[in-house]
């Protein structure tokens, strides 16, 4: 029978190392044996190259595609081939469909004044256009209760948001995650870091010493959770002051 | 050494055909373009054709378009340039030359970073 | 096509001066920030052409540093401090960004 697709790639670009382009076929098809996606940047002397796409479902097809690092006149042909016939043909321009990295290592710390401190990392190096576009959304919700959310947006550059204990409630599990987008490449969001768990906690620490604390997650009376506390935010300042020498 | 070495050139009456050759030394041939330009007595430079690295993608001047065919063999280290349909206009100094690298997705321009001495195509009845 | 205007066509300054050659381009050759498709090359009389400048401000390799290019978009110009005798030749500009490749119409400099 005949191959078709029934909806045509999108494609998205991390804007600095790849391209991930998405299809439909109107059948489930082994997608790395019968197609193949050809890409072609628009310029002098650019050769042809192909990307073996992979299924993502049993009709969906996606393929990752290595690229330069990207800049805004770069303009991809692309090209899907089932064989000799040729399924769909278009153009990408990467700096029209960002879609960021996804940020990394996201960690919550103790800090003064009963906050908790969320720190992760902007995934892209200082010398990538991204680098300073980015600002990011942080969920944050309840283990336990569905409706008990909260959602930030850190527009400022720093990839960190502080947050008062005492807004979470008491002794619940709360889980973290963050993603990020780049307003001025009108970029979607990424997709969302892996989630961070802490037990929340917000009556002054000072008042529990050689109190156990119920924290099933941890199991250690608040002694030891402080030692903890003191060697994370000391740990946190020799990073911060060691980063600001660079 | 980087190395460029023409050859072929000859004088040829108008209608007629030649075929240029170009070995290079001293560099990865297969992942760099190369481009012709040629030089008619006494005039500037003119750009003739280019081709990438693989062979894949070739482009050419008006002015032969349709007459001249660039290609390469990359086991030989061999550029070529088959001309057809000569006319006395084609009368140069057709050089050789190194151009962008093309292996990688965008190619990496240093310019026509190296040029072969040049042969001589005299078209005249 | 590109059309690429050499001025001026011909050139004379006395060894040690500074001789500076414009080149101008129908349309931008900025591809990115900090990519500018324009070469210059040196042509000596009776020898190949050779590389001196490309993307607008990069020198070749073993090109001395008294060659120096500058210019962005569409306005280039190459500059030769402390000319010498052996500097003598046709200069051309050269804009690699897209097919066909185009020539400036080269400038003569000639060392009194």
């Known amino acids: 029978g005949s191959v078709k697709v029934l909806h045509e790639p999108s494609c998205f670009s991390d804007y600095i190392s790849t391209s991930v382009c998405q299809w439909k076929m109107d059948h489930p098809t082994n997608c790395s044996a019968e197609l193949r996606l050809s890409y072609q940047l628009d310029f002098m002397g650019s050769e042809n190259h192909t990307c073996v796409p992979e299924n993502r479902e049993d009709s969906v097809c996606v393929c990752s595609m290595p690229i330069d690092d990207a800049v805004e006149a770069d303009v991809y042909q692309l090209d899907l081939w089932a064989g000799q016939q040729l399924l769909w043909s278009g153009s990408f321009q990467p700096s029209k469909h960002v879609k960021p990295r996804t940020p990394g290592n996201l960690t919550v710390h103790p800090n003064i004044s009963h906050t908790w401190l969320l720190m992760w990392t902007n995934p892209y190096p200082t010398e990538n256009h991204l680098h300073s576009e980015l600002t990011y959304m942080v969920n944050v919700s309840n283990d336990n209760d569905p409706e008990d959310f909260k959602v930030y947006n850190v527009t400022y550059m720093g990839p960190t948001l502080r947050l008062a204990a005492s807004t979470l409630k008491s002794g619940a599990s709360y889980s973290a995650r963050v993603r990020a987008w780049a307003q001025t490449y009108n970029s979607t969001w990424s997709d969302w870091s892996p989630s961070t768990t802490w037990l929340n906690y917000y009556e002054p620490w000072e008042q529990h010493l050689g109190k156990p604390i119920p924290n099933p997650l941890l199991g250690l009376d608040s002694t030891g959770l402080n030692d903890i506390f003191e060697a994370q935010k000391i740990e946190w300042h020799e990073h911060h002051h060691h980063h600001h020498h660079h | 050494e980087v190395q460029l070495v023409e050859s072929g050139g000859d004088l040829v009456k108008p209608g007629g055909s030649l075929r240029l050759s170009c070995v290079a030394s001293?560099?990865?041939?297969?992942?760099?373009?190369m481009t012709w330009v040629r030089q008619a007595p006494g005039k500037g430079l003119q750009w003739v054709s280019l081709?990438?690295?693989?062979?894949?993608?070739?482009y050419y001047a008006d002015a032969v378009k349709g007459r001249f065919t660039i290609s390469r063999d990359n086991a030989k280290n061999t550029l070529y340039l088959q001309m057809n349909s000569l006319r006395a206009e084609d009368t140069a100094v057709y050089y050789c030359?190194?151009?962008?690298?093309?292996?990688?997705?965008?190619?990496?321009?240093?310019?026509?970073?190296?040029w072969g001495q040049g042969t001589l195509v005299t078209v005249s009845s | 096509d590109i059309v690429m205007t050499q001025t001026p066509l011909s050139l004379s300054v006395s060894p040690g001066e500074t001789a500076s050659i414009s080149c101008r381009s129908s349309?931008?050759?900025?591809?990115?920030?900090?990519?500018?498709?324009l070469d210059w090359y040196l042509q000596k009389p009776g020898q190949s052409p050779q590389g001196l400048i490309y993307?607008?401000?990069k020198r070749a390799s073993g090109v001395p540093d008294r060659f120096s290019g500058s210019g962005s978009g569409t306005d280039f110009t190459l500059r030769i401090s402390r000319v010498e005798a052996n500097d003598t030749g046709v200069y051309y500009c050269?804009?690699?960004?897209?097919?066909?490749?185009?020539f400036g119409q080269g400038t003569k400099l000639e060392i009194k």
């Open positions: 993307l607008g401000s």
């Open positions: 030359a190194v151009d962008r690298l093309t292996k990688t997705i965008r190619p990496q321009y240093y310019g026509l970073w190296v």
């Open positions: 050269m804009q690699g960004l897209q097919s066909p490749l185009t």
């Open positions: 001293g560099f990865p041939f297969r992942d760099y373009a």
């Open positions: 081709i990438s690295g693989s062979g894949g993608k070739t």
């Open positions: 349309q931008s050759l900025l591809y990115s920030i900090g990519y500018n498709y």
